[in-house]
Interface confidence: low
């Protein structure tokens, strides 16, 4: 066989060229739809393995959606019919606890996880004889070897990372099954940025196939934790990026989750959204929030897909999604996964295995009810062609979905067999649905969560509460001591109380200056590459949070390091959660905190509050009887009517829903 082109194997230190044979009766040239089940014989390292594959019917829901944009920037929605897709999962005959994620679209491409090794397989470029290359995943990053770096040097470099006699995968899986008996389903939404789309030759089909392949790989990694990955949607920024991707990873992550909350959630329900970018951030290939998978505002991550294979990229996405699922880094903890490095190791690349720590972290998330959105099954367990009525998800064309016939016996509003409302019912679910009827307009459905939030009410003609809005960023709160920011009054005392308990309060300014001028993990103004940044005096109040009067020590799933610094007659308390540089640090002062007269913290700098773009003159716009909300509309006090609070009424805004009911004004809270 001809040697593959340099491009295909330049990232490999060792590989074999093989010709798999198909064991089923159908010829390889069989037309689509692809077989539901197929078996192959493949060779690896002198051994023949029989692999059994089954189409991954859980990978894509029937209503899988792809969003793109035309040249004018108009959103285009496509529901591609890809139920008979070519993405499979399976196992190696006779190999206990093996797993496989392969696509059989144009030859075999994917991952084989055996008990002691993982292999990659892909079609040999320009081969007309169904030849493939197969390689150990461990051999992917040994390119330095051909550049004059000896094996001994590599061994010395990596020896200290290797664990002595890790437990076998069988033991680990047995332990995990006991820990996580109930299957969880992550409804994943992927967004691909313009540069990555361009890099793929602006070929939407190629991007879509690659992202489905990625989801199949993720599913094969997460299945060991009894977590299934379901790709519910894909958005490709074909016409330009819809967020600013200039700046650090933290800035881009913040921009992405804000965009997600504002534009994506309303379009397609999902549990976590992951942005795929071509642009790199130096040493950081991804960033995500920890334990936020079911959060409206923070269930997202960003992932750099540059000059690497999709197989390697899968471990990056698995890592960042793992953070969303409550998993912290394995570093410095007693973790094992039966491999040299595990997916949640901070520096691991190409790892396929989750550690015992990751399983425990995820279990903590579920015990703390942080994973409730993962319980619904996105689609039925039957084949793709099966109707989706009965999956407890209201799909296109359904009015309700109460689940199995047994569950539907308990539902007074929904006809289980048809997923339609019963004849007398107006609704079957939702915050504004009670006893199969819409709640009256003016019924409170989402209360005020802070002095910077506003309530929402049912509108009387929908089962859903009005979309969540809050007071416009930059509005003064805490008696002018702070500003509203994303629905919260951001001030130091409150942040100290979240971390150190109800008696804690902000330390004096001297504490912030003294500690944050050091530029170490306990006192800094952010992290740049491999070093902490020292805070200039003017930015010290925007670095690590410093508290006093501490009487409680925090534990948030991971035990943080706590430092106590004596300063001018008080003790300054700070905390380092050691989450790593791809995770926003909850021990830093929150964005939007007032750090001086007319100033707020942003990106660890004390900057002019004008960056919040607060432009509401409440006297003029709301006639002194209301405040502006996050949509820049007046939210009026009780006694005044929207939109401008100049006539008598019952308060609220054009966004909040009616705050009263003409039949019963006592409904107002």
């Amino acid at each position: 066989a001809a040697r593959p082109g340099f491009q295909q194997t330049s990232h490999l230190s060792s590989y074999e060229i093989i010709t798999p044979w198909r064991l089923t009766r159908e010829r390889r040239e069989a037309p689509r739809p692809y077989s539901k089940q197929v078996s192959y014989v493949i060779q690896a390292e002198g051994k023949e393995h029989i692999i059994h594959l089954e189409r991954n019917k859980d990978l894509l829901p029937e209503d899988f959606v792809v969003y793109t944009y035309n040249k004018e920037g108009t959103l285009i929605t496509d529901h591609p019919n890809i139920q008979n897709h070519c993405h499979y999962r399976g196992y190696v005959e006779g190999v206990h606890n093996s797993s496989i994620a392969l696509s059989d679209c144009f030859g075999l491409r994917g991952l084989l996880h055996l008990e002691n090794a993982s292999y990659g397989i892909e079609p040999l470029q320009n081969s007309s004889h169904f030849e493939h290359i197969i390689y150990r995943m461990d051999d992917v990053y040994k390119e330095p070897l051909k550049c004059g770096v000896s094996n001994k040097d590599i061994e010395k470099e990596t020896a200290k990372d290797e664990e002595e006699e890790p437990p076998s995968m069988t033991q680990l899986l047995r332990r995990r099954r006991a820990v996580l008996p109930q299957t969880r389903y992550v409804e994943l939404f992927i967004v691909v940025d313009k540069e990555r789309y361009d890099m793929m030759g602006r070929n939407q089909t190629a991007v879509r196939e690659e992202m489905i392949l990625l989801a199949n790989y993720l599913d094969s990694m997460y299945i060991m934790l009894n977590i299934r990955i379901v790709l519910v949607g894909l958005e490709i920024w074909t016409n330009g990026n819809l967020i600013n991707i200039v700046g650090g990873a933290g800035d881009v992550l913040g921009n992405f989750v804000q965009w997600r909350e504002k534009f994506l959630i309303t379009r397609r329900r999902h549990d976590s959204a992951q942005l795929v970018l071509k642009k790199g951030f130096g040493g950081t290939a991804g960033m995500a929030f920890v334990g936020t998978v079911c959060s409206r505002s923070h269930a997202g991550g960003i992932n750099v897909f540059g000059q690497i294979t999709v197989e390697t990229f899968a471990s990056i996405v698995a890592h960042e999604l793992g953070h969303n699922l409550g998993m912290n880094h394995d570093d410095g903890r007693d973790c094992s996964c039966g491999a040299k490095s595990c997916i949640m190791n901070s520096g691991a690349s190409g790892s396929r295995n989750f550690s015992s720590c990751s399983a425990e972290d995820f279990e903590k998330l579920t015990l703390n009810k942080g994973g409730n959105c993962l319980l619904n099954i996105p689609k039925p367990d039957e084949a793709y062609s099966a109707p989706s009525c009965g999956n407890k998800l209201v799909d296109a064309g359904e009015e309700c979905d109460c689940g199995t016939p047994k569950e539907c016996e308990l539902d007074p509003c929904c006809e289980g067999s048809t997923c339609k409302l019963k004849s007398f019912a107006e609704c079957a679910y939702g915050d504004c649905c009670k006893d199969c009827r819409f709640l009256p307009g003016g019924t409170l459905c989402r209360g005020k969560t802070s002095e910077c939030d506003v309530p929402e009410y049912c509108n009387g003609s929908s089962q859903f509460c009005q979309p969540d809005v809050f007071i416009q960023n930059g509005y003064p709160c805490q008696n002018n001591k702070a500003y509203c920011y994303n629905g919260m009054c951001q001030y130091y005392d409150a942040q100290c109380q979240v971390i150190f308990g109800s008696k804690a309060k902000a330390a004096p300014k001297d504490c912030f200056i003294e500690v944050n001028s050091k530029g170490d993990r306990f006192g800094n103004c952010g992290f740049s590459g491999n070093e902490y940044k020292k805070c200039a005096t003017g930015n010290a109040l925007c670095g690590k949070l410093q508290c006093e009067n501490v009487q409680e020590i925090p534990v948030f799933g991971i035990v943080p390091a706590i430092i106590q610094t004596p300063s001018r007659g008080t003790k300054c308390w700070g905390v380092d959660f050691q989450l790593g540089s791809d995770v926003p640090d909850p021990g830093m002062v929150n964005e939007g905190t007032k750090c001086g007269a007319g100033k707020i913290c942003r990106n660890f700098q004390c900057v002019d509050a004008s960056v919040l773009n607060y432009d509401c003159d409440v006297q003029k716009k709301c006639h002194g009887h209301g405040v502006c909300n996050s949509n820049k509309n007046c939210h009026c006090e009780n006694g005044w009517a929207p939109p401008n609070c100049e006539t008598k009424g019952y308060g609220g805004s054009v966004d909040s829903g009616p705050t009263y009911n003409e039949m019963n004004t006592a409904l107002r809270d």
Partner: nanobody
């Protein structure tokens, strides 16, 4: 494939200065970081410094902080290592390395994370 060529090495007295260059060619758009390592006779290879291609972020090993400065010229695809106040213990072969894989949290000091290497240039500091 990225190619790296070092130059500028030589013999210098203690307290003197040298400027090393590392010219990159090939698909340099894929480079994330470029670093310098050194290897003295009979010793293990040792990390010296790194610079991030995109934004110029730098990181130095403690033993060279304040004496060595790494910089880059994007237009010329070249990285420089300015070495001042050289000491006899700085004697070694200095090798340039490039990282093209955007690892999540790269350990700059680990040679394993660099995928292209130059041939090296000898620096000898006499006392």
């Amino acid at each position: 494939e990225v190619q790296l060529v070092e130059s500028g090495g030589g013999l210098v007295q203690a307290g003197g200065s040298l400027r090393l260059s590392c010219a990159a060619s090939g698909p340099t758009f894929s480079i994330y970081d470029m670093g310098w390592f050194r290897q003295a006779p009979g010793k293990e290879r040792e990390f010296v410094t790194v610079i991030r291609w995109s934004d110029g972020f730098t990181y130095y090993e403690d033993s060279v902080k304040g004496r060595f400065t790494i910089s880059r010229d994007n237009a010329k695809n070249t990285v420089y290592l300015q070495m001042n106040n050289l000491k006899p213990e700085d004697t070694a072969v200095y090798v340039c390395a490039a990282n093209t894989a955007p690892l999540r949290i790269i350990n700059f000091r680990n040679a394993y994370n660099y995928d292209y290497w130059g041939q090296g240039t000898q620096v000898t500091v006499s006392s």
